[in-house]
């Protein structure tokens, strides 16, 4: 459950949307999941999967609303700050994660083009930075009403306090576990080799172990592929370059924490591969 | 033009402070950060903090926490560096410098202040 | 703390001659910035990001690397450029100097 212990906001604003797409956006994520997506468009904070169902307090997404709405208003008063220049895309990172001792620990660092170059320092309430750029937006947001204070207790009170709160009410989504659905399939390589590639599809939580064993022996981890699906849960393959002919004396073993027991993937026929 | 000008000359007691200025001219003093450096004979710089003169804020590196303070005064475009409880090590010639360059460089720098620490 | 160790710490070029001198950092740096200082004045910006010339600096200057290892290169060496040059990383708190390439002239 460690990976669950952390509820983070990835924030974007870009200073030149494209027509019809937006200006801001969010992706709320508890671990690995993302739960929430807001954007000017729409202008509304949103559960993500499975929080659709999550049994929340009646006013919960109203302040997720008005908090993101604040945020994009900050985020498009930066691109003032920075003036005519350009196009600039402002990127932030906010939350907190609960340590062992279930102390709240935050994070708030922003990024202009893909650089990180400011953060918020709460020791001293305002946000830090020394390229010309952070002076310019640190002090155009220090001037907005009670900014700094805001930023302060959204990291340090309604942060930890949601990140409680989803790990009471929503321990269902966060405990699913769902086992992957596997394939091992060879296919000719250069002259002489074939490529073994085993996959892994729909799992979830993300942590998955791929390996090969030739004759029951560890035969190595491959060169591997990892990514999500859009319904939350993960793929992953890895290949082996193995010598033709030799293809059946592999097999792939899989290790997550939706199965029991280490799987054992055979090769497939190939009048079962498509 | 933009100009750094620092205070002059300082000769101090061991256990001592010393409060050097740095007076910035030809840019808005506001808009970039103020940088310190420490350059000590026959040795390399180190970067000793710096301070946004907008809003306050200021960030040291943490060998110097406890040695300086960084401060600023905007009505005079002014930045301070107070150095307390001076010793030997501290002898050195102390530069400001304009974080105004691409990614903050230090683009412009004072002509540095001399601290001597002797008893 | 990343260190930065330039190389070698004194070197001598003729005039005409190419001058390459090294800095090797003990962590990723994602850019390098060098500085020319001169026998009593104040350091000068030299190069920032890496590979751009600061304004004023002469074209046989150039810089380049990535990650752990970066260099200053003069194509033609000129007698104005004996200095002492520093190079310097903003990636990773503290901002730390290498300890300096003295270049004289022969």
């Known amino acids: 459950a460690e990976s669950h212990l952390s509820l983070l906001y990835h924030l974007t604003a870009v200073s030149s949307p494209a027509p019809g797409t937006p200006a801001f956006w969010v992706s709320g994520w508890l671990g690995p999941q993302q739960y929430l997506s807001y954007n000017s468009l729409r202008g509304e904070a949103e559960p993500c999967g499975a929080w659709v169902w999550e049994n929340q307090v009646s006013w919960y997404w109203e302040k997720e609303t008005t908090d993101l709405r604040i945020k994009e208003k900050l985020f498009l008063e930066a691109f003032k700050a920075l003036g005519g220049k350009g196009p600039y895309t402002l990127q932030g990172l906010l939350g907190c994660e609960l340590g062992p001792d279930n102390t709240s620990v935050p994070t708030a660092k922003f990024a202009l083009n893909g650089e990180e170059f400011m953060n918020f320092d709460l020791k001293q309430g305002t946000w830090g930075g020394d390229w010309p750029e952070a002076l310019a937006i640190s002090q155009r947001w220090q001037q907005q009403d009670k900014a700094a204070n805001k930023e302060l207790t959204f990291l340090l009170f309604s942060c930890p306090h949601r990140l409680r709160e989803h790990l009471e009410r929503g321990r269902g989504n966060l405990e699913w576990k769902e086992p992957p659905s596997m394939r091992l399939k060879a296919r000719p390589s250069s002259p002489g080799f074939s490529v073994l590639t085993c996959s892994a599809f729909s799992f979830y939580p993300p942590e998955l172990q791929l390996r090969f064993l030739r004759n029951g022996l560890a035969a190595g981890t491959g060169q591997g592929d990892f990514g999500p699906n859009s319904d939350g849960s993960f793929h992953a393959s890895s290949s082996l370059t193995v010598k033709s002919g030799d293809e059946h004396h592999y097999c792939c073993i899989v290790q997550h924490a939706g199965l029991a027991q280490p799987l054992r993937v055979e090769l497939e026929s190939p009048a079962k591969s498509s | 033009e933009v100009q750094l000008q620092q205070s002059g000359v300082e000769l101090a007691r061991p256990g001592a402070s010393v409060k050097m200025s740095c007076k910035a001219s030809?840019?808005?003093?506001?808009?970039?950060?103020m940088q310190w450096v420490k350059k000590r004979p026959g040795q390399g710089l180190e970067w000793i903090g710096y301070?946004?003169?907008?809003?306050?804020?200021?960030n040291y590196n943490q060998k110097f926490k406890d040695k300086a303070t960084l401060t600023a005064d905007k009505s005079s475009s002014t930045a301070y560096m107070h150095l307390s409880s001076l010793t030997s090590e501290d002898s050195a010639v102390y530069f400001c410098?304009?974080?105004?360059?691409?990614?903050?460089?230090?683009?412009?720098w004072g002509q540095g202040t001399s601290v001597t620490v002797s008893s | 703390d990343i260190v930065l160790t330039q190389s070698p710490a004194l070197m001598s070029a003729s005039p005409g001659e190419k001058v390459t001198m090294t800095c090797s950092a003990n962590?990723?740096?994602?850019?390098m910035y060098w500085y020319q200082q001169k026998p009593g004045s104040s350091p000068k910006l030299w190069i920032y990001?890496?590979?751009n010339l600061a304004s004023g600096v002469p074209a046989r200057f150039s810089g380049s690397g990535s990650g752990t290892s970066y260099s200053l290169t003069i194509s033609s060496m000129e007698a104005e450029d004996a200095a002492t040059y520093y190079c310097h990383q903003r990636s990773s708190y503290p901002w730390t100097f290498g300890g300096g390439t003295k270049l004289e002239i022969k």
């Open positions: 030809g840019y808005t003093f506001s808009s970039y950060a």
């Open positions: 990001s890496t590979s």
């Open positions: 301070i946004n003169p907008g809003t306050g804020y200021t």
């Open positions: 962590s990723s740096v994602n850019y």
């Open positions: 410098a304009r974080g105004g360059g691409l990614r903050g460089a230090m683009d412009y």
